[in-house]
């Protein structure tokens, strides 16, 4: 569909005569009839197959025709057609004299024709005007013409229909040749497919509008490239959906069992060294000057009574200092300037001369000690607490604070490691000298039977239509992740075709 446009520009009839040679009275009031036909080698009588158009009286004798496309569209003249433009045509333009206002052929005088021209030729669709001039004996007509496509028609012969749209059926504008040009964010033959967010995973993501990234089941993240781990997975990751691969230091079905208490909780204080010793179990090796299970207690260096001969101990930031009684000196007041003559032995101790009286030694009664028998005996000195227990003086008595796993007055009894039921999933516990051992039931393994090794529910390939199978470790069942276009627990139903149930 298109329009043949004819722009009449100038008509010259200087003598003001008709084709018959008779002059017009008072002048030739000129109008035009136009006939557009299919190409004929010799222009023949018959229908104006591409259309006809007539003008009103445009002038008298010689005149220029004003461009009137803005006001009513009389010039250029419009000859619309609703078929494929063939590229060739025949054009007949007649100039007629109208003495009155009635321009019908039957109302005109018998010799009202002024001139007639006929041209044939090729004409491609385009915006450019072709200028032509036809001269007869007494008249001259200057005109131009072109063929353009109607709205929504494109191509070399206006045969390509293209109507821009931005709706469910497409999102495009039309190129000059009639091909579709997708609006930004759309693609496909009819620009119906949205272009998803850049980087959106091809398989795991999709979109219903441009720059969107919606995730398929089992996937998450801005680009749907992160798998969703098993529900309840605490300290684990996945490479495919519903997995729970434990981070280092974690174990168990949901990676919630702490196998690296030291790193995760840093229980040892004051720069102590931490050693993992099982699930939620650890040992702290204290730096000098500290004690306690977590080395949380600061040891006073004077607690070990380093000062001899009745010297008094003073704690300092970087150690201790002994204040020696008269007659003694040295770091620990170990050197004496006294002799037995000075009665240096306290609490009934007896003095013995040494080195020809230059020195002495005290022999202490029971319950007293020290180079001058100045100290009561420390019941902890003999380190009576076994298995690393900590000895504490409590007045006249003493007591042992035991490390985990030991009991008894002197921490001499080994608590059964199995008492805490450390073996998961019904594993059998065996006490060993240095700990315990779990014997696991079928389907489980690991130090504490925490790792499930049950049969892979996906082994039987239960999912249809190329769906991805994931094993649900907590229930020994499988989960099918359906591809686009399928539904059902095994992805067995195409979308839009409900299952036919037998009842």
């Amino acid at each position: 569909s298109g329009v043949f446009q004819l722009q009449l520009q100038e008509f010259i009839n200087e003598r003001g005569v008709l084709a018959s040679g008779r002059p017009c009275e008072p002048g030739c009031r000129t109008f035009f009839r136009v006939c557009l036909k299919h190409f004929q080698a010799v222009v023949s009588p018959g229908p104006c197959t591409f259309g006809t158009v007539s003008t009103p009286v445009l002038g008298t004798n010689s005149f220029a025709v004003r461009d009137d496309s803005s006001g009513g569209g009389r010039n250029p003249l419009q000859l619309p057609f609703n078929f494929t433009w063939p590229g060739t045509f025949s054009l007949i333009i007649e100039a007629w004299h109208a003495p009155g206002d009635d321009l019908r052929p039957e109302a005109l005088p018998p010799d009202a024709l002024i001139s007639k021209i006929a041209i044939q030729g090729s004409l491609a669709v385009g915006q450019n005007w072709l200028l032509d001039e036809q001269t007869s004996t007494l008249t001259r007509l200057r005109y131009s013409y072109r063929v353009i496509c109607s709205d929504n028609y494109y191509g070399d012969n206006c045969s390509r229909l293209c109507k821009k749209r931005n709706d469910h059926f497409g999102h495009y504008v039309c190129q000059p040749d009639g091909n579709l040009s997708c609006l930004p964010g759309w693609t496909g033959e009819y620009c119906q497919q949205p272009i998803c967010l850049s980087g959106c995973h091809e398989q795991n993501g999709y979109c219903s509008k441009p720059a969107e990234c919606l995730c398929r089941p089992g996937w998450q993240g801005r680009l749907c490239n992160e798998c969703i781990p098993h529900n309840g997975c605490r300290h684990g990751t996945c490479s495919t959906p519903w997995q729970c691969t434990c981070d280092e230091g974690w174990g168990g079905l949901f990676c919630d069992q702490d196998l690296n208490y030291c790193t995760h909780h840093s229980p040892c204080k004051n720069g102590a060294t931490c050693s993992n010793s099982g699930q939620r179990s650890y040992t702290c090796t204290c730096r000098p000057g500290y004690t306690g299970v977590d080395c949380e207690l600061e040891l006073s260096e004077c607690d070990s009574n380093p000062c001899r001969n009745g010297g008094s101990c003073k704690d300092q930031e970087d150690g201790y200092h002994c204040l020696c009684p008269p007659g003694y000196y040295g770091l620990h007041c170990e050197h004496s300037t006294l002799s037995c003559a000075d009665s240096p032995c306290f609490n009934g101790g007896s003095c013995r001369e040494r080195n020809q009286g230059a020195n002495y030694a005290c022999e202490c009664p029971p319950n007293f000690t020290g180079s001058n028998c100045e100290k009561k005996v420390d019941r902890c000195t003999s380190n009576p607490c076994a298995n690393g227990g900590q000895c504490l003086n409590r007045g006249p008595s003493r007591m042992c604070r035991c490390r985990p796993g030991f009991t008894g007055t002197y921490c001499e009894l080994h608590v059964s490691d199995c008492a805490r039921n450390p073996c998961a999933h019904g594993g059998t516990c065996h006490d060993l000298e240095n700990g315990l051992m779990c014997t696991c039931p079928a389907g489980f393994s690991g130090r504490r039977c925490e790792v499930r090794t049950s049969i892979d529910a996906c082994a039987s390939s239960p999912c249809f239509n190329r769906a991805t199978c994931y094993t649900d470790l907590s229930t020994d069942t499988f989960v099918c992740n359906c591809p686009y276009g399928f539904v059902g627990s095994r992805c067995e139903f195409p979308v839009g075709l409900p299952p036919s149930f037998p009842w």
């Epitope: 084709a19 023949s44 229908p47 104006c48 018998p110």
Partner: antibody, heavy 119, light 111 residues
């Protein structure tokens, strides 16, 4: 009113030529075409061809080409058909008719001219 | 050449009755949606008279009882109510291609 008046009957010998006239009136002669049609006695109509009055362009039926010529005289609004090398089967009534570019068809006809070819 | 075949050759119809004449072209006479088909009436001793042009358009001064129809290769001329003055020979004619050709004619008479 539109009229096409043809010349009178002609009797010719075989091998001779005949020129029939068709005088138009009541319309702009130059704007139209003139057709020529043959009708043998008791027979149907047979198209011979046409001439475009405004530019003299002609179109002949191949069957008559070489023996027929169309001409016009715009000063007298007359069209002519000359048929040469006459044969006995050229005996017929010959009609002129006008036609136009806007497809009404051959809407006005002359009364016909009888040409008899006989030795 | 395009051959035009008319049927029947002759037709006798009662006054006031419908008369139908068919014309078949050896190839389509349509071009750009227009049928290059005409119907003529010829009474004895007279030149032909144009009845129908472009298959279905009535010529100037033609009574309404004459109508034409068809496209492509098959065309029909119908006289809805035959009158005494309609006795004549009717011709179809194509003008799509040179040479223009006529049908053989159909003679219409009163029954």
């Amino acid at each position: 009113q539109v009229q096409l008046v043809q010349s009178g009957a002609e009797v010719k010998k075989p091998g001779a030529s005949v020129k029939i006239s068709c005088k138009a009136s009541g319309y702009s002669f130059t704007a139209y075409y003139i057709h020529w049609v043959k009708q043998a006695p008791g027979q149907g109509l047979e198209w011979i061809g046409y001439i475009s009055v405004y530019n003299g362009a002609t179109n002949y039926n191949q069957k008559f080409k070489g023996r027929v010529t169309f001409t016009t005289d715009t000063s007298t609004s007359t069209a002519y058909m000359e048929l040469r090398s006459l044969r006995s089967d050229d005996t017929a009534v010959y009609y002129c008719a006008r036609d136009y570019d806007y497809d009404v068809g051959m809407d006005y006809w002359g009364q016909g001219t009888l040409v008899t070819v006989s030795s | 050449d395009i051959v035009m075949t008319q049927s029947p050759d002759s037709l006798a119809v009662s006054l006031g009755e419908r008369a139908t004449i068919s014309c078949r072209a050896s190839e389509s006479v349509d071009n750009y949606g227009i049928s290059f088909m005409k119907w003529f009436q010829q009474k004895p001793g007279q030149p032909p008279k144009l009845l129908i042009y472009a298959a279905s358009n009535q010529g100037s001064g033609v009574p309404d009882r004459f109508s034409g129809s068809g496209s492509g290769t098959d065309f029909t001329l119908t006289i809805s109510s035959l009158q005494a003055e309609d006795v004549a020979v009717y011709y179809c004619q194509q003008s799509k291609e040179v040479p223009w050709t006529f049908g053989g004619g159909t003679k219409v008479e009163i029954k």
